[in-house]
Amino acid sequence: TPLGPKWPEPVFGRLASPGFPGEYANDQERRWTLTAPPGYRLRLYFTHFDLELSHLCEYDFVKLSSGAKVLATLCGQESTDTERAPGKDTFYSLGSSLDITFRSDYSNEKPFTGFEAFYAAEDIDECQVAPGEAPTCDHHCHNHLGGFYCSCRAGYVLHRNKRTCSALCSGQVFTQRSGELSSPEYPRPYPKLSSCTYSISLEEGFSVILDFVESFDVETHPETLCPYDFLKIQTDREEHGPFCGKTLPHRIETKSNTVTITFVTDESGDHTGWKIHYTSTAQPCPYPMAPPNGHVSPVQAKYILKDSFSIFCETGYELLQGHLPLKSFTAVCQKDGSWDRPMPACSIVDCGPPDDLPSGRVEYITGPGVTTYKAVIQYSCEETFYTMKVNDGKYVCEADGFWTSSKGEKSLPVCEPVCGLSARTTGGQIYGGQKAKPGDFPWQVLILGGTTAAGALLYDNWVLTAAHAVYEQKHDASALDIRMGTLKRLSPHYTQAWSEAVFIHEGYTHDAGFDNDIALIKLNNKVVINSNITPICLPRKEAESFMRTDDIGTASGWGLTQRGFLARNLMYVDIPIVDHQKCTAAYEKPPYPRGSVTANMLCAGLESGGKDSCRGDSGGALVFLDSETERWFVGGIVSWGSMNCGEAGQYGVYTKVINYIPWIENIISDF
């Protein structure tokens, strides 16, 4: 058998007066009882109606009844003020049954043809109610053939009576320190047959305060206390209520951090309910007094549990807890009414004693030993031998606690040694040279380490020399014995320096010519600059104008003299620069391989010979006087030359330093 609803058999038909369409007889009484299935009603209308008209249809009539109720008593052909004829009206049973009674009296003044009616069963729309009648369903009504059902809006559930919608209003938990709660639908009437539970649950230490606001309207009874609908408030200490009626209950200070509110309604009534505004309080913490030179934020009348404040110091003051600095400070009020942290101090920023400046000094400008906010100090370098690098030396103690220069630098200024100072103003000779006097060549460095070589001091912790002079020690820098500040090669009175690292030009190939014959030695400590120890300057871009052919340079060293021995005293010689092509040609013939003289070299010496550098001078500086700055600079490095020093037609060959300025600057800045 097919599944699905079993539809009722159709109910429909025709009714007519006896003898219709002929006239009806006197003294007739005929009754029809029509029945429709449950959930259905009967519809009836007349296609013909012709009965004797009488006052209130006392004589002949058709009576329609449904249950105990008379729906209509009909007679005549057309309705009058006191009698009704059906006309085009349709009649409906109130339930599923309809009784039709036809009666004629003992006489008719003229013949009447009676009536013809048709009926049918139709579904009752239970969802349609007459004005003033209670709705079938609380919320939504759904009609269907033979019946109906109710459903509820979200937040409600259908009561077991299948018509009422009870509110789903339990289990709400309020955890904020203040808020509002109300009966469902407030301020519209609250739902029937509902039981609502609301919880306010705050952190321990808080106390909930309840205020009833706006209006209060809960169904009541004149004699019995809230028998229908009621509101109750429960804490861990006591119960308040029940409440009903139209009077706003008083404020309730629960002295509890947890509150349960219960609201119960019955099946009847039409009341707007209630609204509660709740707040909370707690034991206040002591009022925070800002420390001197600080302020509290936010400012409140009182601070209770979970409230917090921060301390902000004025510019130039810092948060300190004892000696320990804080970037920020926030205290939180605890449930016992105490702050979780003690108040810090706002102490004036103290930059502390300024760091010592190597080769310089510091002077307190604001006052002796004053190192606090806005204090001023002045750094300066030791005169004559040091100069301050791009800095005016003035530093101010700023709010961040650092000594800061006018350019915003927090690092110390740098005292750079003054370069190129010499006691000497005129020339002499080495190979065919003469003795140097104190302060003539204060950049001169004696390098011992297997062989005797020379170098020139750069800044206060670098030595410029020839690659071939230190090649063997490139992996053992500590083997180099570096001496300076002396004229006598064998004197015990000198300033000792040690090497930290040796940097040989990557383009230098040992035993394959002398191209790129340049090296730097980094000293493991800075040397103290004085009149006997002063660095040589590196050439400026404009230096080539002082190094043209025939310009005089000066070479110095302890190398071989004309007697064939290493010089005991530092010797020097003034020699002219030789035309590069002339020098190249001089070394084109055997035993020199072609291309011995490169663009990275310069030559100096006399065509007639007699003045030259020699073995033992290697790595030393060929220096020139910059007449604009009146400082000496290194133009060449003693590199190589003829087998016989000072030979006529041959020249001393020097590494051309100006070609290596980027290389030198990179090494020094990187290391």
């Epitope: 004892g322 600095p325 804080l326 970037k327 942290r341 961040d400 606690g401 650092f402």
Partner: antibody, heavy 114, light 107 residues
Framework: QVQLQESGPGLVKPSETLSLTCTVS?????????WNWIRQPPGKKLEWMGY???????SYNPSLKSRITISRDTSKNQFSLKLSSVTAADTAVYYC???????WGQGTLVTVSS | DIVMTQSPATLSVSPGERATLSCKAS??????VAWYQQKPGQSPRALIY???YRYSGIPARFSGSGSGTEFTLTISSLQSEDFAVYFC?????????FGGGTKVEIK
């Protein structure tokens, strides 16, 4: 969870420089507080050596001022201790800690011996 | 330097009893004092800061009091895990200094 971890050589020769690093996790050293180095020679009491603050400022124990440097590497969230010219008296367990000691490293023993 | 003097050097207490440890500063340090517990081979553990503020996670049996030059750490009812060395520490002035410690041992 804030954690501090000291690292560095356990043996240093006299006259050399002792170098230790404290790596901080769970909190940025630039966010707040002072970051301390504290040491404890065997059987002796704790000695505060110095701190570097959230801003990079330093404060040193005057007894060590000529030998101590505290620096930081904010990219690695580390701060470091350098103590120069060490002697046997510098043998101790070295701790790094935050502010007034709410968090400490586990400590590292440094022995100064040739 | 501010000297922090702890007394007694050793305190013998039975479990469940109260222990009172004293720390005296040679100068006024306000309330800038912390207390630490140290067990052998371990780093110190912070108990109290600012003389009387207990760190979170520290049992309520530990309490600190005092200000100025006299400070006290009280352990209301000693548990077996409380037997250790306790240090006080002032952070009021440079250099920060520590007390010599009080060893709390089982009686």
């Amino acid at each position: 969870q804030v954690q501090l971890q000291e690292s560095g050589p356990g043996l240093v020769k006299p006259s050399e420089t002792l170098s230790l690093t404290c790596t901080v996790s769970g909190y940025s050293i630039t966010s707040d507080y002072a970051w301390n180095w504290i040491r404890q020679p065997p059987g002796k009491k704790l000695e505060w050596m110095g701190y570097i603050s959230y801003s990079g400022r330093t404060s040193y124990n005057p007894s060590l001022k000529s030998r101590i440097t505290i620096s930081r590497d904010t990219s690695k969230n580390q701060f470091s201790l350098k103590l120069s010219s060490v002697t046997a008296a510098d043998t101790a367990v070295y701790y790094c800690s935050r502010h007034y000691g709410d968090y400490w490293g586990q400590g590292t023993l440094v022995t100064v011996s040739s | 330097d501010i000297v922090m003097t702890q007394s007694p050097a050793t305190l013998s207490v039975s479990p469940g009893e109260r222990a009172t440890l004293s720390c005296k500063a040679s100068q006024n340090v306000g309330t800038n004092v912390a207390w630490y517990q140290q067990k052998p081979g371990q780093s110190p553990r912070a108990l109290i800061y600012s003389a009387s503020y207990r760190y979170s996670g520290i049992p309520a049996r530990f309490s600190g009091s005092g200000s100025g030059t006299e400070f006290t750490l009280t352990i209301s009812s000693l548990q077996s895990e409380d037997f250790a060395v306790y240090f006080c520490h002032q952070y009021n002035a440079n250099p920060l200094t520590f007390g010599g410690g009080t060893k709390v041992e089982i009686k």
